[in-house]
């Protein structure tokens, strides 16, 4: 058993049917010695007496809040959370994994050291999250994260809807122009009722870069059905742009066609590469769509920014 | 060329070649679900690789003040990787295909390093560690680690040359 925070303890339990359970000693935080009784929010009536209560924890009924009393007065509380281990593997039941088998998905719109991580939950009830740097070595990268919040968007996976939580983090000391040598290491602690789980991830900022879409997409008619389409770097992208350059993929989106956000890199079927912020295209109907990607490192591409082929005269 | 005494390199040529290096580095190791070898332990294999760090003057301000520090660091890295790609790690089994991106990458690393340092002028270079894995799968894991590290290195170098070409070219 170890202390998660004041008066909250995590008990690591072997979740196999014939496991003996974990023996836990709870001590009442009081100078009193006599006439102390114990209750649990999971069971009826008095469950023990004495300054120290010894219990065997093997199921969720054994978790929860234990309170010691004397003569009708509450002396102290101890809250027990269970961390399940089955066949040597820690449980991962609170979060739902994304398509690529990861539980935490982090993205950065630029190289400033600011990034957002998100995760999906199976059931949005009685949840508490805490995300922090998981590496304690002196040369590790320190990160400060805010509070996790529930996103408005729901995510559908395998025909089921999941709630999405997000958190913003910022690396304490950043050097956007350097080559990263140590990854950022994060741990997410998740609590649901009396269950405790932890999840970890490790990444370089360069690998989680996902630019925002190009902005100010505009059309200028040329001859026949040729148009010049132009755009600008997104405001959130790192500067100067002569140093932090983007490349762009341009695609004609036919009417009724949906633009897919793929997991397999930007160079989608039918898209062509442009390094400037304008190009000429043949555009008869539908939309012209543009997405951005770091010019020199193949991290994720932005969402598509689209503009109708019709040119307002 | 970054000639002795610190005159400017051919920024535009360096920009073009470093951008080609980025493309080749990704063709050499695309980082997708094909990497099916069980993940290796973090053995000390590519720790001696020269990295472009914060104090190396490779940021826009540092390049404006004196690009030589940064160019020297880039040159050092190019030579280091060029030697690694020419070592047993890449020449051993499984052997490289004749027209492979890795082969072109090796040649381009040499090409860019020569653009930065003409004959007769020598910047200090770093020794490459003597790594000679006996098993092909160990060699493959090392290749992947080296190429992944090279992708990050050439991305920073390409940014430096792109910025130099845009702002420091005479």
């Amino acid at each position: 058993m170890w202390e998660l925070e004041k008066d909250v303890y995590v008990v690591e339990v072997d979740w196999t049917p014939d496991a003996p359970g974990e023996t836990v000693n709870l001590t009442c935080d009081t100078p009193e010695e006599d006439d102390i009784t114990w209750t649990s929010d999971q069971r009826h009536g008095v469950i023990g007496s004495g300054k120290t209560l010894t219990i065997t924890v093997k199921e969720f009924l054994d978790a929860g809040q234990y309170t010691c009393h004397k003569g009708g007065e509450t002396l102290s509380h101890s809250h027990l959370l269970l961390h399940k281990k089955e066949n040597g593997i820690w449980s991962t039941e609170i979060l739902k994994n994304f398509k690529n088998k990861t539980f935490l998905k982090c993205e950065a719109p630029n190289y400033s050291g600011r990034f957002t991580c998100s995760w999906l939950v199976q059931r949005n009830m009685d949840l508490k999250f805490n995300i922090k740097s998981s590496s304690s070595s002196p040369d590790s990268r320190a990160v400060t994260c805010g509070m996790a919040s529930l996103s408005a968007e729901k995510v559908t996976l395998d025909q089921r809807d999941y709630e999405k939580y997000s958190v913003s983090c910022q690396e304490d000391v950043t050097c956007p122009t350097a080559e990263e040598t140590l990854p950022i290491e994060l741990a997410l602690e998740a609590r649901q009722q009396n269950k405790y789980e932890n999840y970890s991830t490790s990444f370089f900022i360069r690998d989680i870069i996902k630019p925002d879409p190009p902005k100010n997409l505009q059309m200028k008619p040329l001859k026949n059905s040729q148009v010049e389409v132009s755009w600008e770097y997104p405001d959130s992208w790192s500067t100067p742009h002569s140093y932090f350059s983007l490349k762009f993929f341009v695609r004609i989106q036919r009417k009724k066609e949906k633009m897919k956000e793929t997991e397999e890199g930007c160079n989608q079927k039918g898209a062509f590469l442009v390094e400037k912020t304008s190009t000429e295209v043949q555009c008869k109907g539908g939309n012209v769509c543009v997405q951005a990607q770091d010019r020199y490192y193949n991290s994720s591409c932005s969402k598509w920014a689209c503009v109708p082929c019709r040119v307002r005269s | 060329r970054a000639v002795p005494g610190g005159s400017s390199p051919a920024w535009t040529q360096c920009q073009q070649l470093s951008q080609k290096l980025c493309t080749l580095a990704w063709s050499a190791h695309p980082l997708v679900g094909h990497m099916d070898l069980r993940e290796e332990g973090d053995e000390e294999t590519t720790n001696d690789v020269p990295h472009i760090q914060c104090g190396d003057g490779c940021d826009p301000q540092g390049l404006r003040d004196n690009s030589q520090f940064c160019l020297q660091r880039i040159h050092q890295g190019l030579i280091f990787y060029e030697k690694l790609l020419g070592s047993d790690i890449f020449t051993g089994e499984p052997s490289l295909l004749p027209d492979s991106p890795v082969g072109q990458l090796h040649a381009s690393l040499l090409g860019l390093s020569q653009l930065l340092q003409p004959e007769g002028h020598h910047w200090e270079t770093q020794q490459i560690p003597s790594l000679s894995p006996s098993q092909p799968w160990q060699r493959l894991l090392l290749r992947f680690k080296i190429l992944r590290s090279l992708q990050a290195f050439v991305a920073v170098a390409a940014r430096v040359f792109a910025h130099g070409a845009a702002t420091l070219s005479p």
Epitope: G265, N267 | V32, H34, E93, P94, S100
Partner: antibody, heavy 120, light 107 residues
Framework: QVQLVQSGAEVKKPGASVKVSCKTS????????ISWVRQAPGQGLEWMGL????????NYGQKVQGRVTMTTDTSTSTAYMELRSLRSDDTAVYYC?????????????WGQGTMVTVSS | EIVLTQSPDFQSVTPKEKVTITCRAS??????LHWYQQKPDQSPKLLIK???QSISGVPSRFSGSGSGTDFTLTINSLEAEDAAAYYC?????????FGQGTKLEIK
Amino acid sequence: QVQLVQSGAEVKKPGASVKVSCKTSGYTFTYYGISWVRQAPGQGLEWMGLISAYNGNTNYGQKVQGRVTMTTDTSTSTAYMELRSLRSDDTAVYYCVTENINWRDAFDIWGQGTMVTVSS
Amino acid sequence: EIVLTQSPDFQSVTPKEKVTITCRASQTIGSSLHWYQQKPDQSPKLLIKYASQSISGVPSRFSGSGSGTDFTLTINSLEAEDAAAYYCHQSSSLPYTFGQGTKLEIK
């Protein structure tokens, strides 16, 4: 994830041609090559040849040399294998597999196979 | 071309038994030998690459050894689901070649 999806089964007459497609997804097509392997009913595996999607280079096995053409269409991330002058011993399941373009490697990802039957 | 000869061609075994399949190359191929498993009406699946390197997702009872011309695939404690054909494959030089296969039947 990486997937190779092949075209459906074909029935052909001797002397005809067949063109099997292999549509890839989940990775950057031009960073890999495609090998073609076939398997006659109840028989073992036979390598037919390979094509690099990176530079279009091909290498064909001796048994099908002169009758086979392997191509790629990078705009649709699809590889094709055309076999001409079909004979009854070309009846087989044809598989496409991903091929490393940097060094000779194992075949880690396979298509589901396309049954080609040559019969008069 | 390099000829790969597998033995045995066929083997009938009981569950929990240890199975050994060998593959001999007509000339030296270093460690560029790979093993595949093929179940009826399925595509082959990579089990071992470069003679001895295990693949993620493949049960640890499958192991490989050898180099040069003689190679072995070992299945420790055979399970019913291991009934399949097993092929060796060399990628040392073109044309790539496969062994003729070993069919494993569970008694």
